[in-house]
Interface confidence: low
């Protein structure tokens, strides 16, 4: 299709080489079409456009995105050629930064229903460059946390080194919707709720003698609870002794609750004490079995193929730790009375003999 009639917008993405960040392009179709095609209307509910030249209001089609090669080749369908660029309704998400994202991006409605619709398109000229090292050290992160229930603020990374007084007028979006209540380089949140979480975009205009560009940055905002002040607690095993049958397989599960930490490095391991020896056991990976706003429950199992006489003399210890401290729970195995027949006991003794030989040839010291 002929793109000469498309409205044009110039954008600049100055990415930080120090951190991962994303970028977003909106399909800014001319009003009133934009409000009709995309779920990011800038009209208030009371402002209804006079006419909708595109399509029936019951259809809310997506838009189609293209990239225009610099050498004049035909337009490329982004979905096919650029796996790191994701199409989502009326937005284009760049998952990884890099100068190779520089180029012209065109969007238009997928469904064209009348001759007037053909010119309904937007061409975005995107320039991508690494941020100069001269920019300030304390620039805001592209991932920002807000503490639930407290006051907080979201800063525009590309302007965070400027004072509010010298900052240009900023346009903010949250999850693709225009936020009209602020034009400064910071959004101040009086009380943080869960719904403050999301993808924020801040835009401001930068002009030189030749042309003007929209400088854009994307911020992922997380709403979090405060870091825990408690060490983890072990929910299971509760008992310090466990009745077992000799010669039978056994799984002992350790479940522990870890309070929320912004930097979360949980430690959970099993080790065995036998007389004056102590060693860590190689067990399956720990897995998260429940996550909530305030804590996470993690489970890790120790698996014995067959319980031996030697296991009855050992202590099995689950050790858990976070940045505050550690907790342990010891389990001693106790033979179930009258459970196994003579064959089971002979079999268990045979296994124990093999294991003793193997243990003496390896004896892994833990401490």
């Amino acid at each position: 299709f002929n793109i000469s009639g498309c409205s044009t917008k110039k954008l600049l993405w100055a990415y930080s080489t120090r951190s991962e960040e994303e970028f977003i392009l909106f399909c800014d179709l001319p009003e009133p079409q934009k409000s009709h095609f995309c779920h990011r209307s800038q009209l208030s509910p009371t402002q209804v456009p006079d006419h909708l030249p595109f399509t029936d209001s019951k259809d809310l089609p997506d838009v189609q995105w293209y990239r225009q090669p610099s050498n004049g080749d035909p337009l490329e369908d982004i979905r096919k050629s650029y796996p790191h660029i994701i199409q989502d309704k009326c937005t284009l998400r760049f998952l990884t930064p890099g100068v190779n994202n520089t180029g012209s991006y065109i969007c238009r409605p997928k469904m064209i229903k009348s001759p007037y619709d053909v010119a309904c398109c937007v061409k975005m000229i995107l320039e991508v460059k690494p941020q100069s090292n001269a920019s300030c050290e304390n620039s805001a992160s592209h991932k920002q946390d807000l503490l639930l229930g407290s006051t907080g603020s979201i800063s525009c990374p590309s302007l965070s080194c400027q004072s509010d007084a010298q900052s240009p007028e900023v346009t903010w979006y949250k999850n693709g919707k225009l936020l009209s209540m602020t034009r400064s380089n910071r959004i101040v949140v009086d009380e943080v709720y869960i719904y403050h979480q999301g993808t924020y975009v801040c835009d401001y205009t930068q002009s030189d003698t030749a042309s003007s560009w929209t400088v854009r940055a994307v911020v992922q905002v997380r709403t979090i609870v405060g870091d825990t002040k408690l060490k983890p607690d072990i929910l299971d095993p509760v008992e310090s002794t466990l009745e077992v049958e000799l010669g039978k397989p056994l799984t002992i599960s350790c479940k522990a609750r870890f309070g929320f930490e912004r930097v979360f490095n949980p430690v959970m391991k099993w080790y065995i004490k036998d007389a004056d020896l102590e060693w860590e056991v190689s067990v399956p990976e720990a897995k998260s079995i429940k996550s909530t706003l305030k804590d996470e429950i993690i489970e890790r199992n120790i698996i014995l193929e067959k319980v031996t006489q030697r296991d009855l003399r050992r202590t099995f210890v689950c050790f858990v730790q976070n940045s505050i401290g550690n907790t342990t729970q010891s389990v001693q195995l106790k033979e179930k009375r009258g459970s196994g027949g003579l064959n089971d006991i002979f079999e268990a003794q045979k296994i124990e003999w093999h294991e003793t030989v193997r243990f003496q040839s390896h004896h892994h010291h833990h401490h």
Partner: antibody
Framework: QVQLQQSGPGLVKPSETLSLTCTVS????????WTWIRQPPGKGLEWIGY???????NYNPSLKSRVTISVDTSKNQFSLKLSSVTAADTAVYYC?????????????????WGQGTTVTVSS | AIQLTQSPSSLSASVGDRVTITCRAS??????LAWYQQRPGKAPKLLIY???NWESGVPSRFSGSGSGTDFTLTISSLQPEDFATYYC?????????FGQGTKVEIK
Amino acid sequence: QVQLQQSGPGLVKPSETLSLTCTVSGGSISNYYWTWIRQPPGKGLEWIGYISDSGSTNYNPSLKSRVTISVDTSKNQFSLKLSSVTAADTAVYYCARETIVVRGFYFYVMDVWGQGTTVTVSS
Amino acid sequence: AIQLTQSPSSLSASVGDRVTITCRASQGISSALAWYQQRPGKAPKLLIYDASNWESGVPSRFSGSGSGTDFTLTISSLQPEDFATYYCQQFNSYPWTFGQGTKVEIK
């Protein structure tokens, strides 16, 4: 423990507006999304829409033109209005709490449900 | 809207049986899937969220797995109280949608 108590008429005439209310007890309406879901007789579940405690809404496009969900934080209540009803709107209507669980980033769970209100559209 | 297709639509099983229900999404939804149990005349009850996490108080015989487009709910040893209808639901993009349900009946 949070509980959701539904109220509203069980019979609505065609072309009229269906109105249901869900009262939250044992907890606050703050910090959550509040959802309506319906289930026609012998059929599956259909999401109608949600409202947050701040009043922001999101509706199923198939019902958007007829649905209004509102919240009254002072009464710990949220409500559903469905206009111009027909026999096809006969269903059990449920209210539910939608929690955002945070660990790294977000996902959603509908963890508390109302008891359900059977609404019949008939003249 | 994302469509979720459950299979089978219904199944007959005995107490103690291992039961597997699958849910297929019409497009990738990462792990944004929940499973619910609904007994006759009752509201749905959340079992699993984020594809594989147990909701508090749900017995460990229920487990969920999968990501992308294919998901599974497994009941390792069916109990009398497990005879019900099970629904999957996606939380990946609006509108939230449900599968058509799988009815687990007594053989």
